[in-house]
C-alpha cells in the first residue's frame, strides 16, 4: 500500500502552503525507500536517493514556482509515481448569513472569508436548542444535529424547513479543504432573522369625484402562509411624480385611501410588510405602482388638514380590522441565548422619508 495518505481532493495531487516547508510523498514505493526526484519534463535531479529523506521530497519555503508535477524514481530507475503539487491555504472560518421569509422556514448562505485556492467543500448542519419555560435560561438537551440540505445546483445555501418560531437554532458551516477544516457556529432564531417578502399585487386607483384621493390595495406575499397568530402589518409610502420625499402611513389591513394626493399628478406608491408583533425587520419595498387622482366632478371633501396623511376604508376584511389575536402566551425570554452574532441580511435598503 502507498505510504502517502490521500488528502481529500483529486487523486495524485498533494498540497502545501505558500511560504511553508512542503513534503511530497512518492506514492508507488514502500515507506522509507530512497528515491530520486525530478520535475516533470526536466532532467535536473532535485533530490537524490542519498538525501536521507527516503520516499519524501522536502521543498523549503514553497512558492508558486514550485507548483506543478514531480516524478519520483526508485534506485533501479523504475517509476515510483507522479505527484502534482498545488499550493493554497487552510480554510478560514466561513462567513454565514441566515434569513427567513416566513415563520417556519429559513435559509443560510455562506462565503469563504478567504479564498484558499484549493478544492473546497462545505459541511452544513444544524441543531435545535429549546428553552425550558418562559422564565428559564436553562437549555434542554440539544436535539440534532441534522444535515442542513444544500442547494442541489451548487449555490452556497442550505434550507431548514419546518423550523419552530420560538426555538433557537445553532448552524454549523464547516469549510473543508485538503489542508484542514474550519467551522463557523452561528445561533439564530426565526424571530430575529424574519424578513417577509414584499407585498404583492399592489394596485393604485383613483377615487371618482375625489381629486385628492387614491385607493391602494395589495395582498400578502405568496411565501407567507397566513395563520391567526402570524399576521403581517404594512407600511405604505407615496409621493407625487418628481417629488423627492415619500410620505409614510401604516395602514390597517390590505388597503389604504390616500387623502392628500396632489390633484392631477401621477403618484408612485409602494408597500412593505413586517410581522405584526415586530419580529425581525421590514420587508423590501414592493415594486412601485402608479396612479393619478380622478379629475371628475368634485365631491364634498372633509378638509384634508383634519384627516392627517391617510384614511382607512371602512370595508376592510374583518380579520384585518379586528384586534389581532395574541400569540401563545408561553414564550421564551426574547433575549439572545448566547453570544453568537445575529445575522446580517444580504442587502440593505435605504428608506427615504
Amino acid at each position: 500500500s502507498s505510504p502517502c495518505p490521500q488528502a481529500w481532493g483529486p487523486p495524485g495531487v498533494q498540497y502545501g502552503q505558500p511560504g511553508r516547508s512542503v513534503k511530497l510523498c512518492c506514492p508507488g514505493v514502500t515507506a522509507g525507500d530512497p528515491v530520486s526526484w525530478f520535475r516533470d519534463g526536466e532532467p535536473k535531479l532535485l533530490q537524490g536517493p542519498d538525501s536521507g529523506l527516503g520516499h519524501e521530497l522536502v521543498l523549503a519555503q514553497a512558492d508558486s514556482t514550485d507548483e506543478g508535477t514531480y516524478i519520483c524514481q526508485t534506485l533501479d530507475g523504475a517509476l515510483g509515481g507522479t505527484v502534482t503539487l498545488q499550493l493554497g491555504y487552510p480554510p478560514a472560518r466561513p462567513v454565514v448569513s441566515c434569513q427567513a421569509a416566513d415563520y417556519e422556514n429559513f435559509s443560510c448562505t455562506w462565503s469563504p472569508s478567504q479564498i484558499s485556492g484549493l478544492p473546497t467543500r462545505y459541511l452544513t448542519s444544524y441543531r435545535k436548542k429549546t428553552v425550558l419555560g418562559a422564565d428559564s435560561q436553562r437549555r434542554s438537551p440539544s436535539t440534532g444535529p441534522w444535515p442542513c440540505p444544500q442547494d442541489p445546483l451548487g449555490a452556497a445555501r442550505c434550507v431548514v424547513h419546518g423550523a419552530e418560531f420560538w426555538s433557537q437554532y445553532r448552524i454549523n458551516v464547516t469549510e473543508v479543504n485538503p489542508l484542514g477544516a474550519s467551522t463557523r457556529l452561528l445561533d439564530v432564531s426565526l424571530q430575529s432573522i424574519l424578513r417577509p417578502d414584499p407585498p404583492q399585487g399592489l394596485r393604485v386607483e383613483s377615487v371618482p369625484g375625489y381629486p385628492r384621493r387614491l385607493h391602494a390595495s395589495w395582498t400578502y406575499p405568496a411565501s407567507w402562509r397566513r395563520q391567526p397568530h402570524f399576521l403581517l402589518k404594512f407600511r405604505l409610502q407615496y409621493r407625487p411624480a418628481q417629488h423627492p420625499a415619500w410620505s409614510t402611513v401604516e395602514p390597517i389591513g390590505l388597503e389604504e385611501v390616500i387623502t392628500d394626493a396632489v390633484a392631477g399628478l401621477p403618484h408612485a406608491v409602494r408597500v412593505s410588510a413586517r410581522d405584526f408583533l415586530d419580529a425581525g425587520t421590514w420587508s423590501a419595498w414592493s415594486p412601485e405602482a402608479w396612479g393619478t387622482p380622478s379629475t371628475g366632478p368634485l365631491q364634498d371633501e372633509i378638509p384634508d388638514w383634519s384627516q392627517g396623511h391617510g384614511q382607512q376604508l371602512e370595508a376592510v376584511v374583518a380579520q384585518e380590522d379586528s384586534p389581532a389575536p395574541a400569540r401563545p402566551s408561553l414564550q421564551p425570554d426574547p433575549r439572545p441565548l448566547d453570544h453568537r452574532d445575529p445575522l446580517e441580511q444580504h442587502h440593505h435598503h435605504h428608506h427615504h422619508h
Partner: antibody
C-alpha cells in the same frame, strides 16, 4: 508588501453623503475579506463594516446599518464605503483593513478623515 | 454584541519596565482575540492574534495569553517605540469589537 490607501474623506454637512475608496496592492485582493474601521476624535477604534471576497455577504455595525454600504470591485482592487445620511457622530478617521486567515484586520491603511459638520 | 473591557485605561512606565494589560470579554470568545498598538497619525499595528500568537515581524518581548473571557497582554521590557495606545479586539462573532484601549506613556 501589503498596501492599503484610503481616499475620499473630507468635510460634509449633516445629512450629506460621501464615498470612501481604498486602493489595495501587494496581494491578491479578490481572495480576501476586507473591512472598514473608524476612530472618532479622542475615542477608541470601532469596527464599521466587512465584506466577503465575492462581495456576496456584507456585515454592518448597528450604528451605520441602513446608512452605509460597503462594496468592492475586484477588477480594480478597490474597496468602497458609501456613506449616506451622515451625522456629526460619524466624524472619524476611517481605516481600510484586510483580514487574513480568518484573523480580522491584520493589515491597515493610514486612514482618511471624514468630518461631518455644518 | 460582545463588550470588551480593558484595564488599566492608562499607565505610566519607564523604558525597561514590565507592562501587563488585561482584557475581558462579556461572553466566551474562545481564543479569537487580537492585540494592537496604535500611535497617533499612524495605522494600528497587529501584534498578537488568536490570543497568544506573535504576528510576523513583531519583537518577542510582546506576548499574549488567555482564553474564554479573560486575556492578558505583556511587554517584558518596555522600549521607547512601545509607547502608544493598546487595544484588544474580539473576532469570535461576525461583528468584531474593540476594547476601549490602554494608553502607555513615559513616566
Amino acid at each position: 508588501e501589503v498596501q492599503l490607501l484610503e481616499s475620499g474623506g473630507g468635510l460634509v454637512q449633516p445629512g450629506g453623503s460621501l464615498r470612501l475608496s481604498c486602493a489595495a496592492s501587494g496581494f491578491t485582493f479578490s481572495r480576501y475579506m476586507m473591512g472598514w474601521v473608524r476612530q472618532a476624535p479622542g475615542k477608541g477604534l470601532e469596527w464599521v463594516s466587512s465584506i466577503v471576497p465575492s462581495g456576496g455577504i456584507t456585515i454592518y455595525a448597528d450604528s451605520v446599518k441602513g446608512r452605509f454600504t460597503i462594496s468592492r470591485d475586484n477588477s480594480k482592487n478597490t474597496l468602497y464605503l458609501q456613506m449616506n445620511s451622515l451625522r456629526a457622530e460619524d466624524t472619524a478617521v476611517y481605516y481600510c483593513a484586510r483580514d487574513h486567515m480568518g484573523i480580522v484586520a491584520t493589515d491597515w491603511g493610514q486612514g482618511t478623515l471624514v468630518t461631518v459638520s455644518s | 454584541d460582545i463588550q470588551m473591557t480593558q484595564s488599566p485605561s492608562s499607565l505610566s512606565a519607564s523604558v525597561g519596565d514590565r507592562v501587563t494589560i488585561t482584557c475581558q470579554a462579556s461572553q466566551d470568545i474562545t481564543n479569537y482575540l487580537n492585540w494592537y498598538l496604535h500611535k497617533p497619525g499612524k495605522a494600528p499595528k497587529l501584534l498578537i492574534y488568536d490570543a497568544s500568537n506573535l504576528q510576523t515581524g513583531v519583537p518577542s518581548r510582546f506576548s499574549g495569553s488567555g482564553s474564554g473571557t479573560d486575556f492578558t497582554f505583556t511587554i517584558t521590557s518596555l522600549q521607547p517605540e512601545d509607547f502608544g495606545t493598546y487595544y484588544c479586539q474580539q473576532y469570535d462573532t461576525l461583528h468584531p469589537s474593540f476594547g476601549p484601549g490602554t494608553t502607555v506613556d513615559i513616566k
